[in-house]
């Protein structure tokens, strides 16, 4: 867990993050494990430490080895290990398995390929993308931020995709490449504008003062795995966490259920010890995905403890 494999190509930039994460204020010391020699922090060095990051600008095959990072808080020191391997550049087109990042899957509706490790680097758009060493051209391919989008994905789009970008450090530019496999799932999924199953729009929920009450926000977003979908509650237009009433909490986590093949989510709002002032609040069940946002509003009304039906003579 706290030993992480990292790899790169000679003469390219490689930046490695300490596998032992800490708060931003903590100091991090880096050592070359074999010699216990401290890694310098001065940026004039080809290999230097910069907080949580260890930078090889550029990397050399001889840099391969295990590096130790010690994260220091005021009272605790915690250790991580980065196992770095730098490979010689291949003369041919094939990318060996040991240089491949994790495989990603796509489908007709969701075909994003993220460029691995790019968040560690200081890069500027656009990314260059290659498939099996060929530069990608044509309107079906769109390089967007740190990912590639392929329109109308077909099974022939499966293959090895390489992203190439430039890392800038103090005015100097270094090339970085990263490759991962892309597989295509034949998935008949689809995404819809959210449909809220509960609560009904402008529903009045009867509650008893002093008792606990639960409100469930339930919505469906289409069929199959959804790329982005969420349900949440708001109080008077404010997020629950920002509202500041500890009696009112959203149930932790969201469970994705597939009833009738539909992808649905629900979020339970728990109100402990219902008070009079809770009846004055507006409770909004929000469901959102890439298509947009739908909102159903609920209000609470007082339920008499003895709720006899009226008897008409």
């Amino acid at each position: 867990k706290f030993s992480k494999q990292s790899w790169g190509l000679e003469n390219e930039a490689l930046i490695v993050r300490c596998p032992r994460q800490g708060k931003p204020s903590y100091t991090v010391d880096w050592y070359y494990s074999q010699t216990n020699k401290s890694i310098p922090t001065q940026e004039r060095n080809r290999v230097f430490a910069s907080g949580q990051l260890l930078k090889f600008l550029p990397a050399a095959v001889a840099d391969s080895g295990i590096y130790t990072c010690i994260v220091r808080s005021p009272t605790f020191n915690r250790t991580g290990y980065a196992n770095v391997t730098i490979y010689k550049k291949q003369s041919d087109c094939n990318v060996p398995d040991y240089l491949m990042y994790s495989t990603v899957s796509g489908s007709e509706k969701n075909s994003k390929i993220y460029c691995p490790t790019i968040d560690l680097y200081n890069w500027t758009a656009p990314l260059e993308w290659f498939k099996n060493c060929q530069a990608l051209q044509g309107s079906r391919y769109r390089a967007h931020k740190s990912f590639l989008v392929i329109d109308n994905v077909m099974t022939e789009d499966a293959g090895d995709y390489t992203c190439k970008f430039i890392h800038n450090e103090n005015g100097a530019n270094y090339s970085v490449t990263a490759t991962r496999s892309f597989t295509v799932k034949d998935e008949q999924g689809f995404s819809l504008f959210p449909v809220i199953g509960a609560p009904a729009q402008n529903e009045i929920k009867e509650v008893e003062i002093g008792k606990n009450a639960n409100l469930t926000c339930s919505a469906c977003f289409g069929k199959g795995t959804q790329f982005l979908a969420a349900v949440l509650w708001q109080l008077n237009g404010t997020k629950i966490t920002d509202f500041g009433e500890p009696r009112i909490q959203q149930e932790e986590g969201q469970n994705q259920s597939f009833s009738n093949g539909l992808a649905c989510l629900d979020m339970v709002l728990r109100i402990a010890d219902v008070k009079e002032e809770d009846l004055l609040l507006q409770y909004d069940c929000l469901a959102l995905n890439l298509h947009g946002l739908r909102r159903h509003t609920v209000r609470l009304s007082r339920k008499n403890p003895i709720d006899h039906h009226s008897i008409y003579c």
């Epitope: 706290f2 708060k23 808080s73 009272t75 605790f76 915690r78 909490q249």
Partner: antibody
Framework: EVQLLESGGGLVQPGGSLRLSCAAS????????MIWVRQAPGKGLEWVST????????YYADSVKGRFTISRDNSKNTLYLQMNSLRAEDTAVYYC????????????????WGQGTLVTVSS | EIVLTQSPATLSLSPGERATLSCRAS??????LAWYQQKPGQAPRLLIY???NRATGIPARFSGSGSGTDFTLTISSLEPEDFAVYYC?????????FGQGTKVEIK
């Protein structure tokens, strides 16, 4: 000096509610994850709940999920545990404790503990 | 959830003797394991974190070892103030869990 002081314990009937507080001092409360741990009389320690420093993510033991709510007021340096639908098996000393390290998605040890407050659920 | 099993339940030793306490996890916790000491009427006190690191102010006679599923707390030479209950705790994932405790008592 780091100090945690629990309050709000007492005798309550089954089905009743209680709200525990933990007043923190001697450290920057808002950046630390906070935890409730309980210990039934003569028994071992049981983790109850964790809340992240910024107050966003919360985690609960299955035994209290849906009945207990952890919250915090960073402006008052105070941690809370709202306990509803109390049962006899909730009888315990409740400790609040600090996690001195955690980053989102991870947990760590408990380096400072309060002295505990006793909650007794009995009719 | 990850179950931690401590053994023995009770350890009867004399001051100056070596104490060896065991904690076994139902699945790997890497080195995300801590040891606490608790005396009657007091809150627990952190002794060891990340399986083998002593917390600030903890005497050198306390040491921890192990990784994965098997862990050991060793007290090299028991002092009178070391007689207490000791708990292990994993923090690799929620729910955080504790062992049931080992009581170290005076023989």
């Amino acid at each position: 000096e780091v100090q945690l002081l629990e309050s709000g314990g007492g005798l309550v009937q089954p089905g009743g509610s209680l709200r525990l507080s933990c007043a923190a001092s001697g450290f920057t409360f808002s950046i630390y994850d906070m935890i409730w741990v309980r210990q039934a009389p003569g028994k071992g320690l049981e983790w109850v709940s964790t809340i992240r420093g910024e107050g966003g993510s919360t985690y609960y033991a299955d035994s209290v999920k849906g009945r207990f709510t952890i919250s915090r007021d960073n402006s008052k340096n105070t941690l809370y545990l709202q306990m509803n639908s109390l049962r006899a098996e909730d009888t315990a000393v409740y400790y609040c404790a600090r996690d001195p390290w955690s980053t989102e998605g991870s947990f760590f040890v408990l380096d400072y503990w309060g002295q505990g407050t006793l909650v007794t659920v009995s009719s | 959830e990850i179950v931690l099993t401590q053994s023995p339940a009770t350890l009867s030793l004399s001051p100056g003797e070596r104490a060896t306490l065991s904690c076994r996890a139902s699945q790997s916790v890497d080195d995300d394991l801590a040891w606490y000491q608790q005396k009657p009427g007091q809150a627990p006190r952190l002794l060891i974190y990340d399986a083998s690191n002593r917390a600030t102010g903890i005497p050198a006679r306390f040491s921890g070892s192990g990784s994965g599923t098997d862990f050991t707390l060793t007290i090299s030479s028991l002092e009178p103030e070391d007689f207490a209950v000791y708990y292990c705790q994993q923090y690799i994932t929620a729910p955080l869990t504790f062992g049931q405790g080992t009581k170290v008592e005076i023989k």
